[in-house]
């Protein structure tokens, strides 16, 4: 039975040209996290495997930095980066947990972080 929950940074906004940290956290389970995949719609941004380290998709290699931790730093933001991002936690023995973050990249200089929320 999967008992864990993914806590994410929820809905966030950031300025064009700036950077943002995408972060998820798995709680309420003793399952071992073996890998975290970061995806935007149907496109893979990065993989962090507990043993093998990081894979960064070539199309993002100049704008994505591993970490902090299992998170992902997205740099040189453009308006086209607005959209849904998913952290997919591969765990043993539970299986897969998915968290969602919505990023809005703003033209203006005012960008505030949204509230944290949980996805079961």
């Amino acid at each position: 039975m999967m008992t864990g929950t993914i806590e994410t940074t929820g809905n966030i906004s950031a300025e064009k040209g700036g950077s943002i940290i995408l972060q998820c956290h798995l709680s309420s389970t003793t399952a071992q996290v073996t890998q975290v995949n970061w995806e935007q719609q149907d496109q893979l941004l990065a993989i962090c495997n507990a043993d093998l380290g990081w894979h960064i998709s070539p199309s993002f290699k100049d704008r994505v930095a591993p970490g902090p931790g299992l998170g992902l730093t997205l740099q040189s933001l453009t308006v086209n980066d607005t959209g849904e991002y998913f952290c997919i936690y591969h765990t043993y023995p539970d299986g897969t947990y998915t968290g969602r973050i919505f990023l809005e990249v703003l033209e203006s200089s005012v960008a505030e972080h949204g509230a944290r929320f949980q996805i079961p």
Epitope: N37, L44, A50, D51, L52, H55, S59
Partner: antibody, heavy 119, light 107 residues
Framework: EVQLVQSGAEVKKPGSSVKVSCKTS????????IHWVRQAPGQGLEWIGG????????IYNQIFRGRATLTVDKSTSTAYMELSSLRSEDTAVYFC????????????WGQGTTVTVSS | DIQMTQSPSSLSASVGDRVTITCKAS??????VVWYQQKPGKAPKLLIY???YRFTGVPSRFSGSGSGTDFTLTISSLQPEDFATYYC?????????FGGGTKVEIK
């Protein structure tokens, strides 16, 4: 020039063990994961597992867990794959291969080591 | 485990032909797919990764595409040195798995 040079062919009895070595050169050993892949005669490729010399992380394909052991000697930039409790189905060519940096793609390969298991 | 199914398993073609090999994943693998070329008695060689980037030194006649579950390797104009077996591989989740291979033979 990146090179991975493997040890020579082995003939083993069922139930015994084999240890294949993979001597690397031409790059910083601790910056790249070493994977092991095997190929039975006339068959496709099968991933055994990988070893990350940067933090000694080891990952195995579940079907080899408990029989395969991946190790490295950082002082000689050499990787090793030991397979125990050998059976005839383990007859194959065993390849060591390096993963590209920040990419889960195997960019350089050893020449392969033929392991024959026969009574 | 994720199964990678390649088709066809073999094909016959002539020099200059356009060749297309497909690879279907049993579940979503995003764009975490790699293609290798292997000649008899030799180790595989990295061709394409992620899944449309050519590895260093790979001729431009080789191209890859796809996302999700369906992937394609295309050789735009087959050359004599391209007769070999081609394998797809996914690294979306462990264990990493390979397709069964496609053998490209001379017609």
């Amino acid at each position: 020039e990146v090179q991975l040079v493997q040890s020579g062919a082995e003939v083993k009895k069922p139930g015994s063990s084999v240890k294949v070595s993979c001597k690397t050169s031409g790059y910083t050993f601790t910056e790249h994961v070493i994977h092991w892949v095997r190929q039975a005669p006339g068959q496709g490729l099968e991933w055994i597992g990988g070893f990350n010399p940067n933090h000694d992380g080891t990952i195995y394909n579940q079907i080899f867990r408990g029989r395969a052991t991946l190790t490295v000697d950082k002082s000689t930039s050499t990787a090793y794959m030991e397979l125990s409790s050998l059976r005839s189905e383990d007859t194959a060519v065993y390849f060591c291969t390096r993963a590209a940096k920040l990419l889960f793609a195997m960019d350089y390969w050893g020449q392969g080591t033929t392991v024959t298991v026969s009574s | 485990d994720i199964q990678m199914t390649q088709s066809p398993s073999s094909l016959s073609a002539s020099v200059g032909d356009r060749v297309t090999i497909t690879c279907k994943a049993s579940q979503h693998v995003s764009n975490a797919v790699v293609w290798y070329q292997q000649k008899p008695g030799k180790a595989p060689k990295l061709l394409i990764y992620s899944p449309s980037y050519r590895f260093t030194g790979v001729p431009s006649r080789f191209s890859g595409s796809g996302s999700g579950t369906d992937f394609t390797l295309t050789i735009s104009s087959l050359q004599p040195e391209d007769f070999a077996t081609y394998y797809c591989q996914q690294h979306y989740s462990t264990p990493w798995t390979f397709g069964g291979g496609t053998k490209v033979e001379i017609k």
